[in-house]
Interface confidence: medium
């Protein structure tokens, strides 16, 4: 058998789509595997053809685009379903071939059941708001390609079960939905239902985003390093255990990278002899804001150690900070023997 | 989830000392602040100090310098309130309360408390 | 030290009612972007509950109908339509500066 370019089966592009819904599922060679477009290579006499596994089966087949009403039909790059039917699920694989060349890829297509309040097994894309920032909309997702540009279709707009009508800070503007104020009780997940006519049939679709409201970057601050700080003193014995905490406060930004990290005597702990641990641990709070705690822990410290720099820095795309723990070594209580002899001139 | 567990209930003599202890589970111990407020019976809640258990570092309220120790045991995440030299008005429900972190150093609330241990103090 | 006077020292209040609590510091307890001052509730023979940290960010899981407002020395908690399970007592309390904590002297919200 001639050779073939083989992608493999694409599990990045999960692909999820509603039952009894229109989906239009483009073939991801053009979008991310082949440098050349779907026009040029069927200009160049290359030949797209599709083939599916359903569920649960090894048995490669044809896709059937004979069937009532051209429920399964194909148009250029694109595979469209009017609509799908929970047993269209399987893996799908677009092939591009002529007699010299050949490239094919699959991809996994998921047709997900919802109930009356659009709950679904769906994996739902997050849409970030800033707090209390001003005017911030969403826009319904993919429904580019589903129908031409003459048709006005209606979009009704769901928070959780509830239409959004008459909501105090939320107003739906066609295609989009504005959030005047953002607030905490606007996390949730937001629905948008776009109906619209083709050839004397109704189509529905369906997406659903969730919201998050995180911080402001109009309240964004750089790190701020609550441990060590200048109240705390780490006062211990040689033999003892040294646990230092680094604990830094991150505001949220978007895409920010957050870092925290130790250095001893101005180097990274890997770099230096000496035996440390580091633990990390990272919270959130309901803006997203983050507060990571890197734990410096020597277990049997000696009075070298003691002697140390031990500083913790933390970096953000707001600035880098830095504070030096206050490390020393617990003076020993006099031993009250000794000094009553030296007091009386004992040699 | 985060929780604070204190020792049962005392009865001491005046003079005599206490030592009531608060079991933390769920977070990372080291790394919060926990003090130790009080309560006489109908009366209001008193801030009486504050222990770092990375370091051991303590702060009293000014009313019970010389009076109050606290202490903890990392290995066990237990801090320790001990008072002593006690009479009939040290009478009260001793908590402990975790503090939480803010984006600013010095100010913190207390998000987590235990659920309180009587201490009567009576001849 | 400062000092925190609460009032009134006891309310009453009808299921459905709007309840204010006023907490005055002796000095000032806030800075640029936050103040040092929270509200806790307490129920007879349990531990204070944290309610609103930070003047007026409301602590997770508290119900909305709580809030807080205010800024250097004057502070307010409200309960918006006060429910059967609010009757209870309430304290402000600051943390500005270490090491000293202080706490309002309490009021007590009752059933009319």
């Known amino acids: 058998s001639e050779r073939c370019d083989d992608w493999g089966l694409d599990t990045m592009r999960q692909i999820q789509v509603f039952e009894d819904e229109p989906a239009r599922i483009k073939c991801p060679l053009f979008e991310h595997f082949l440098k050349f477009n779907y026009s040029t290579a069927h200009s160049a006499g290359l030949t797209l053809i599709w083939y599916w596994t359903r569920q649960d089966r090894d048995l490669e087949e044809p896709i059937n685009f004979r069937l009532p009403e051209n429920r399964i039909s194909k148009e250029k790059d694109v595979l469209w379903f009017r609509p799908t039917l929970l047993n269209d699920t399987g893996n799908y694989t677009c092939m591009l071939r002529n007699t010299t060349y050949c490239s094919k890829v699959a991809f996994p297509l998921e047709v997900v059941q919802k109930d009356s309040c659009f709950n679904s097994p769906m994996k739902l894309p997050v849409h970030k708001l800033y707090i209390e920032y001003g005017i911030q909309r969403i826009t319904c997702p993919n429904v580019d390609g589903y129908f031409p540009s003459s048709v006005k279709p209606t979009i009704t707009w769901y928070m959780g079960c509830y239409k959004i009508q008459n909501f105090n800070n939320v107003i739906p503007e066609g295609m989009n939905l504005s959030f005047l104020i953002a607030l905490i009780s606007n996390n949730g997940n937001y629905t948008c239902v776009v109906t619209y006519p083709e050839n004397g049939r109704t189509f529905h679709l369906t997406r659903t985003l969730t919201v998050k409201v995180v911080g402001s970057p109009k309240n964004a601050v750089p790190p701020v390093i609550h441990s060590p700080n200048d109240h705390v003193v780490y006062e211990k014995e040689p033999g003892e255990e040294l646990l230092i905490p680094c604990t830094v406060y991150f505001s949220f930004l978007m895409d920010s990278r957050n870092e925290v990290w130790w250095t001893i005597d101005g180097k990274k702990p890997d770099d230096i002899t000496i035996d440390v641990t580091i633990n990390e641990s990272i919270s959130h709070s309901r803006t997203e804001d983050e507060t990571r705690t890197q734990i410096l822990s020597i277990k049997k410290v000696t009075s070298e150690d003691l002697k140390r720099s031990y500083v913790c820095h933390a970096r953000s795309a707001k600035g880098e900070v830095a504070k030096a723990a206050k490390v020393k070594q617990k003076v020993p209580a006099p031993r009250y023997t000794v000094e009553l002899a030296c007091g009386f001139g004992a040699t | 989830q985060v929780q604070l567990v204190q020792s049962g209930a005392e009865v001491k003599k005046p003079g005599a000392s206490v030592k009531v202890s608060c079991k933390a589970s769920g977070y990372i111990f080291i790394t919060y602040w926990m003090n130790w407020v009080r309560q006489a019976p109908g009366q209001g809640l008193e801030w009486m100090g504050q222990i770092f258990p990375a370091s051991g570092t303590t702060y009293y309220a000014q009313k019970f310098q010389g009076r109050v120790t606290m202490t903890r045991d990392t290995s066990t995440s237990t801090v320790y309130m001990e008072l002593s030299s006690l009479r009939s008005e040290d009478t009260a429900v001793y908590y402990c309360?975790?503090?939480?972190?803010?984006?600013?150093?010095?100010?913190?609330?207390?998000?987590?408390w235990g659920q309180g241990t009587l201490v009567t103090v009576s001849s | 030290d400062i000092q925190l006077t609460q009032s009134p020292s006891s309310l009453s209040a009808s299921v459905g009612d709007r309840a204010t609590i006023t907490c005055r510091a002796s000095?000032?307890?806030?800075?640029?972007?936050?103040?040092?001052m929270h509200w806790y509730q307490q129920k007879p023979g349990k531990a204070p509950k944290l309610l609103i940290k930070?003047?007026?960010d409301l602590e997770s899981g508290v119900p909305s109908r709580f809030s807080g407002s205010g800024s250097g020395t004057d502070f307010t908690l409200t309960i918006s339509s006060v429910q059967p399970e609010d009757f209870a007592t309430y304290y402000c309390h600051h943390s500005w500066g270490i090491p000293m904590y202080t706490f309002g002297q309490g009021t007590k919200l009752e059933i009319k």
């Open positions: 000095q000032s307890v806030s800075t640029s972007g936050y103040s040092s």
């Open positions: 930070y003047a007026s």
């Open positions: 309360a975790r503090t939480d972190f803010y984006r600013y150093d010095g100010g913190y609330a207390l998000d987590y």
